[in-house]
Amino acid sequence: NKGTDDATADSRKTYTLTDYLKNTYRLKLYSLRWISDHEYLYKQENNILVFNAEYGNSSVFLENSTFDEFGHSINDYSISPDGQFILLEYNYVKQWRHSYTASYDIYDLNKRQLITEERIPNNTQWVTWSPVGHKLAYVWNNDIYVKIEPNLPSYRITWTGKEDIIYNGITDWVYEEEVFSAYSALWWSPNGTFLAYAQFNDTEVPLIEYSFYSDESLQYPKTVRVPYPKAGAVNPTVKFFVVNTDSLSSVTNATSIQITAPASMLIGDHYLCDVTWATQERISLQWLRRIQNYSVMDICDYDESSGRWNCLVARQHIEMSTTGWVGRFRPSEPHFTLDGNSFYKIISNEEGYRHICYFQIDKKDCTFITKGTWEVIGIEALTSDYLYYISNEYKGMPGGRNLYKIQLSDYTKVTCLSCELNPERCQYYSVSFSKEAKYYQLRCSGPGLPLYTLHSSVNDKGLRVLEDNSALDKMLQNVQMPSKKLDFIILNETKFWYQMILPPHFDKSKKYPLLLDVYAGPCSQKADTVFRLNWATYLASTENIIVASFDGRGSGYQGDKIMHAINRRLGTFEVEDQIEAARQFSKMGFVDNKRIAIWGWSYGGYVTSMVLGSGSGVFKCGIAVAPVSRWEYYDSVYTERYMGLPTPEDNLDHYRNSTVMSRAENFKQVEYLLIHGTADDNVHFQQSAQISKALVDVGVDFQAMWYTDEDHGIASSTAHQHIYTHMSHFIKQCFSLP
């Protein structure tokens, strides 16, 4: 960093709020789609190019002029695995976080024409190609249909779909948001013979209702009704089926074979939480009890002579937690060997760190192939010789990510493939493997500017740089950019990591205002080595505010001792630790302890509010965006994972004493800005409405802003600009900045 004198001498512009809002400085991505083990597609100037991974040469796969006469704006495209057809998506209409409806057309790449017969209907909810060939499965009006050929009629698989009641092949609200992180509840077998699907029944699930004001001309607001199970409420039920798509015929209804949940699940409420095909005729299902500390994996085989699926009890694998819940957010997915007789899975070891364990389907116990006081983040690829994974082992930094390979014939032979490639610039990697893992793209996202490179698995040789963001680098040379510090403090003999976005020419002998940017939900991580251009960049660069984040108890990727510390006790340690972090920061000598603020969104809004309502005296002000205020208001799957049930026999007491409203009196000591979107389907406006009411009832003056018809992301262009401008004014006023 440059010294104090340089700050005044530095005539370069700063990174402004407008720069953030208008995205003046754009990070370039290199988004590729593998189509084979040696080829990928890449979109350049709206042409789709096909690249040879080995040599880097490309040819035009599809010219941008192909669809000039199409008459619709194409939102996305998807090429069939055999390369014969392209699915075009248009008329995109967002629903929730992942779900949307759209229209689709299919273009025949051989005939170079659109298929006009037997088209997929408008308002289709989900479409997916089979893994090989060009079959299509889609969901329309909550029912599943299959096309064997793009130009042939669809075969209807289900007949029970009903809006907001029965969902076939798609998730309801809570499964989409909290279980599968997807709208799709369809799973093709590897060769496309079988189609597995879930059916969700929301008949008894209570509805959340909220007004949608829409256009000014709408005299009466619309009421949106969504089946949404809040903590302790009636949950959706689930059934699971497999249909043989080779059996489909127009003159007879498709026969779907049900696979029932294990007996140990059927005794009470439960979830389907993972579906993974092991082989062409073997499927694994993971089920989870409503009290999410007990899960069962079933491995089911197709019996050709009966056409049924058999799940042997001897092949069941139980995963449980005595200290918290199973998995980071749900049980991890298995990665099967080619023969389907064994698999690798990330589970908690005896010390509470998440590592890879090797299972044989007929044996209960597994063998850990990794170990240490660090965690495996994800299994990325499995070949006959190696398993590739991402972990945060390198240099003992939980906020880093690197790619490793482990030799399956000798687990002691582990190689870090990314650690030494560019150690200053790149400490946080993700990866994208080709179809059979012969090649991989490394995506480095920090601490330096993002870097995309291509590598060969044969010798782990770097083949070429795909994108180095050199143009952005050149632009940012002319900007006074903040620096990022990643370090830890020790509390009760435990390391807790924090990051600080420090103003340009940071001088530790000076006093700076500090904004604590908080999330702090279970298994969260805010202190990492990722490069970001965001609101914090502006605050540090232009307003000379230190923006800090701290991963306290409850945070992830550092073992269950830390993560499970908040089990059954949301709103306690994770809140206290943010306060303690701020105290520690103010002792560092460069923080103006009269100007400490806190802000957060969603869970971060809850923690922000709980911190401001704690009466700690540490914080002058804070902003809560779309906060949870009482856990009984939030959804069952997420909330009960950590809190159990809001019943007297379980954990009702803590549900009741972890509300923001109960701390209303303490808000008299702070300046508070409360913000929420009125059409938030996730954290309902109700949550902020109740905070507001409680504050009014005890005479607290506070600031508030609602965003009409905005959801949990407050992401429309105008609302996004407005909220960040509004929060900037609030923070500047709080810190007495001009």
């Epitope: 130009n151 043989n244 059996s247 015929s249 127009s250 003159v251 007879t252 050709e304 002579s305 056409g307």
Partner: antibody, heavy 116, light 107 residues
Framework: EVQLVESGAGVEQPGGTLRLTCTAS????????VHWVRQAPGKGLEWMGV???????DYDAAFMSRVTISRDTSKSTAYLQLNSLRAEDTAVYYC??????????WGQGTTVTVSS | DIQMTQSPSSLSASLGDRVTITCSAS??????LNWYQQKPDGAVKLLIY???NLHSGVPSRFSGSGSGTDFSLTISNLEPEDIATYYC?????????FGSGTKLEIK
Amino acid sequence: EVQLVESGAGVEQPGGTLRLTCTASGFSLTTYGVHWVRQAPGKGLEWMGVIWGDGRTDYDAAFMSRVTISRDTSKSTAYLQLNSLRAEDTAVYYCVRNRHDWFDYWGQGTTVTVSS
Amino acid sequence: DIQMTQSPSSLSASLGDRVTITCSASQGIRNSLNWYQQKPDGAVKLLIYYSSNLHSGVPSRFSGSGSGTDFSLTISNLEPEDIATYYCQQSIKLPFTFGSGTKLEIK
């Protein structure tokens, strides 16, 4: 390789019962339906009925009262039983594999003569 | 039941000729029509499914078209091995029904 082989042909008595066997190989009877189609001498093809992959059956109304199609999945065989035989049941009988909405593989056919 | 009417019932053509056989349904069957070839020895093969889709292994000189009630099978360049009887069949509704057949001979 997909194959269907019909057997059980021969001369049958009027009023008697015909039982034909179709031995399938290269595919599963629980996946694909098996149809029976016949062809009287010098005439066209006539659909008789089907046993679907899930074991359900459908018959042409013309044969409904006297035809039964069944199967033994463990032996990978389908059967056609036709009761109350008459002279006009003299025909070549084919078993045929169903694929979606078409018949993609046909057996070679077996000749049945109904005569006293 | 849906009646399928095929014409002509027989036809004679020369090698290399373009031959068209027609089939009409007594009611609309969309595109649910298949064509089969029966050789003189009685062996039956699928040629075209769903009106216009060539079954795997069938020479490209065979093509099908039509929808609703009127369909046709065309052989663009007649070969000696094409001597056979050709049948259309509807598959939209049970009972499945066949046309009466068109016997193709070489002049």
